[in-house]
């Protein structure tokens, strides 16, 4: 029997300090550019080497950004989201959603939380 793929979704608050070259990442998504089917949210598409986000290490490509400095990113045009980041100031607080892929084995397979015997 084949295993199935599940996702573990977690949220995290990430505080970044804008570096010399900015925050150091790219985004996709928005109401005019759905990146994920039926989801107009904003997603991290690239983390730039040696940028603030990369040096911090917590933000990952594929993360969904839920808010910036407390401002919700729902129902924003792509460029409006970009502008929000650019105008976010020196200290930037991001609420992000990580989506980790978890490979589950066939039924009866011992889970990670089970005793190893």
């Amino acid at each position: 029997m084949n295993g199935r793929v599940d996702y573990l979704v977690t949220e995290e608050e990430i505080n970044l300090t804008r570096g010399p070259s900015g925050l150091g990442f790219n985004i996709v998504g928005g109401t005019d550019q759905q990146y994920v089917s039926n989801d107009s949210g904003i997603y991290v598409s690239r983390i730039k080497e040696n940028g603030a986000a990369a040096l911090d290490g917590r933000l990952q490509e594929g993360d969904k950004i839920l808010s910036v400095n407390g401002q919700d990113l729902k129902n924003l045009l792509h460029q409006d989201a970009v502008d929000l980041f650019r105008n976010a100031g020196y200290a930037v607080s991001l609420r992000v959603q990580h989506r980790l892929q978890v490979q589950n084995g066939p039924i009866g397979h011992r889970g990670e939380g089970d005793p190893s015997g």
Epitope: G22, G24, V28, R46, G51
Partner: nanobody
């Protein structure tokens, strides 16, 4: 493997026109920002025009009204139509691609791009 290949350059008379193309392979163009840059002998590479992932176009002041950028995602191709060419437009023209929009700088900033083509020479003489 991500690849960008420019074509369509050549020798053109002042006041003439030329269209250069950038064909991408190894990725789907849809969510990519594409920029055109040029480098004249002895000068730094400069941004000419770019088009973001939702089709918004940007131009450096010196080419506004003369150059037009467009994209055909179905053909994985971005075009730069250059009209009313001047001798100072002579340069090697490069296209570049970046996945998504930088939250830090406009797409005319060459430091934001991850992928570059080899360039095509345009000579106005």
């Amino acid at each position: 493997e991500v690849q960008l290949v420019e074509s369509g350059g050549g020798l053109v008379q002042p006041g003439g026109s030329v269209r250069v193309s950038c064909v991408s392979s190894g990725f789907i163009l849809d969510y990519y920002v594409i920029g055109w840059f040029r480098q004249a002998p002895g000068k730094e590479r400069e941004g000419v025009s770019c088009i973001d992932s939702v089709g918004r176009a940007y131009y450096v002041d010196s080419v506004k009204g003369r150059f037009t950028i467009s994209r055909d995602n179905a053909k994985n191709t971005v075009y730069l139509q250059m009209n009313s060419l001047k001798p100072e437009d002579t340069a090697v023209y490069y296209c570049a691609a970046d996945f998504g929009s930088s939250v830090d700088s406009t797409c005319l900033n060459n430091q934001q791009y991850d992928y570059w083509g080899q360039g095509t020479q345009v000579t106005v003489s």
